[in-house]
Amino acid sequence: TQNKALPENVKYGIVLDAGSSHTSLYIYKWPAEKENDTGVVHQVEECRVKGPGISKFVQKVNEIGIYLTDCMELSTELIPTSKHHQTPVYLGATAGMRLLRMESEELADRVLDVVERSLSNYPFDFQGARIITGQEEGAYGWITINYLLGKFSQKTRWFSIVPYETNNQETFGALDLGGASTQVTFVPQNQTIESPDNALQFRLYGKDYNVYTHSFLCYGKDQALWQKLAKDIQVASNEILRDPCFHPGYKKVVNVSDLYKTPCTKRFEMTLPFQQFEIQGIGNYQQCHQSILELFNTSYCPYSQCAFNGIFLPPLQGDFGAFSAFYFVMKFLNLTSEKVSQEKVTEMMKKFCAQPWEEIKTSYAGVKEKYLSEYCFSGTYILSLLLQGYHFTADSWEHIHFIGKIQGSDAGWTLGYMLNLTNMIPAEQPLSTPLSHSTYV
């Protein structure tokens, strides 16, 4: 008789990434009988929630339910009804909500309360909403990319999952850039981690990892821009801010109240003789780069070496996956290729920033102007952060791999978060059975 496939025994999980600028929902799927194996979980869907990040709903929390509806309804359609009640749903909020909590714990709780009430009405196993720490965000991002790259697998493969994957079992570092924070996480080479706050110990699949991680709050691309504007307006002679980080001919009016709304600009706050100012782009990469560098305090370091702002950073080691906004921005600028050197990236950024705004708008007619206008700043910021902030060099630049997806799953903290909460990363190497009998009869 012919072997006949049994109905597949699969499990699902949902993670909502409540970021500072938007919320994304990820649906994951894995074979139930293999959940302790490495690399078996994969993403089946990403649904981007229409609208801003949840922290922006603080004055309109009654709209949160509607905001989440489309992606949650999609989940009920994509996941078989019989699996709904056993499908865990997790929501992790990141730096946008960390900033709101710094302003007011009650306001942050108010938003999360309504989020939890809204999500609990769906037929899934809702496991709560929480603000994850920067350390968790870094650690779970590191776990995600190394899980997807097969770095935790004890079997050395003769094939390569992705073009840039090295066949050795050395883990990749993780570079994550969001709107409000940025994380750097990697295993340093035989280096003691001088600052306990930055040290993580993991035992995964029978191997110990001593991991360095740090999350720089306020150094995500959006908050870094607010910081830069607040710093630069201090020395403006009037309500015109000639800004090298925007294209020549670009103009935008900014409310001073919006500028000082975020805790990230508090250190630059001053009484200004105007309520609004106008950004006028002059499109000069070099000047933009110099202005950005002023956000990094490198004059003080209580350790053998630092990134910036007195934060310990061990010497960089190995390859790094750069994802989230690192990837989105560099992808837009067409700078993700392994073959593009750091010098070439800088050269292309100089050209891009110098392009007149009218020309840019014509060339990228399909892109929203709000986003389009900020690519010059974001690209320059990424270079400044990686080179001067994290001390990558022209030589070590080739060890940075700009990654969107690995094996169809987005690089980011959500998969690692779910793997951890569902206990799918065992501390010890599971005993592997020579053959799995469960699929055929």
Epitope: E106, D109, D113, V114, S118, S120, Q127
Partner: antibody, heavy 121, light 107 residues
Framework: QVQLVQSGAEVKKPGSSVKVSCKAS????????ISWVRQAPGQGLEWMGS????????NYAQKFQGRVTITADESTSTAYMELSSLRSEDTAVYYC??????????????WGQGTMVTVSS | EIVMTQSPATLSVSPGERATLSCRAS??????LAWYQQKPGQAPRLLIY???TRASGIPARFSGSGSGTEFTLTISSLQSEDFAVYYC?????????FGGGTKVEIK
Amino acid sequence: QVQLVQSGAEVKKPGSSVKVSCKASGGTFSKYGISWVRQAPGQGLEWMGSIIPEFGIANYAQKFQGRVTITADESTSTAYMELSSLRSEDTAVYYCARESGGYRDHRLGVWGQGTMVTVSS
Amino acid sequence: EIVMTQSPATLSVSPGERATLSCRASQSVGSNLAWYQQKPGQAPRLLIYGASTRASGIPARFSGSGSGTEFTLTISSLQSEDFAVYYCQQYLLWPLTFGGGTKVEIK
């Protein structure tokens, strides 16, 4: 001191609906969640759903989803629980209770006196 | 949903003695646990919240302990008015769930 006063006992036919009210006095109504909990004769406590009057946002236990509707009227500081398609198993005392801890703290600090709902043909 | 299990179902204790009631959660609820007392014909009354904090007006003989999945309510010296049914409730996640109750009766 907050007090919750519920409407009187009801006798209902199977298939019909019942709407129980819960009026708050002596404290802030809007900000704190109001939960509804029922207790069948000789049985334990069963949470049905909750609402934050300030936002009008309700959430429900899966068991009652589609059959229960919880609403609130801020102007009269009154919460309501309507249960439809009644069956004999819905015979119980229905309590409203205030979630006293503020946002995300759902301990039930103040309870109504209870409303007996009997479903019988 | 989180399942709350109470034991024993009935506890027979003499007045003046100590009573220890247990409550177990099917997954960690941190310290988001409350204890209620219910007397016949009355609404429940909050005794303990946050696993160990006494609600206002609750006598010192009532104490709560535990965190994660294992919790205990202790009544140090039972008074006649303490004979009642006691329920634990988790409020970490929706739906809010209660234990089946422990009836404390006179021995």
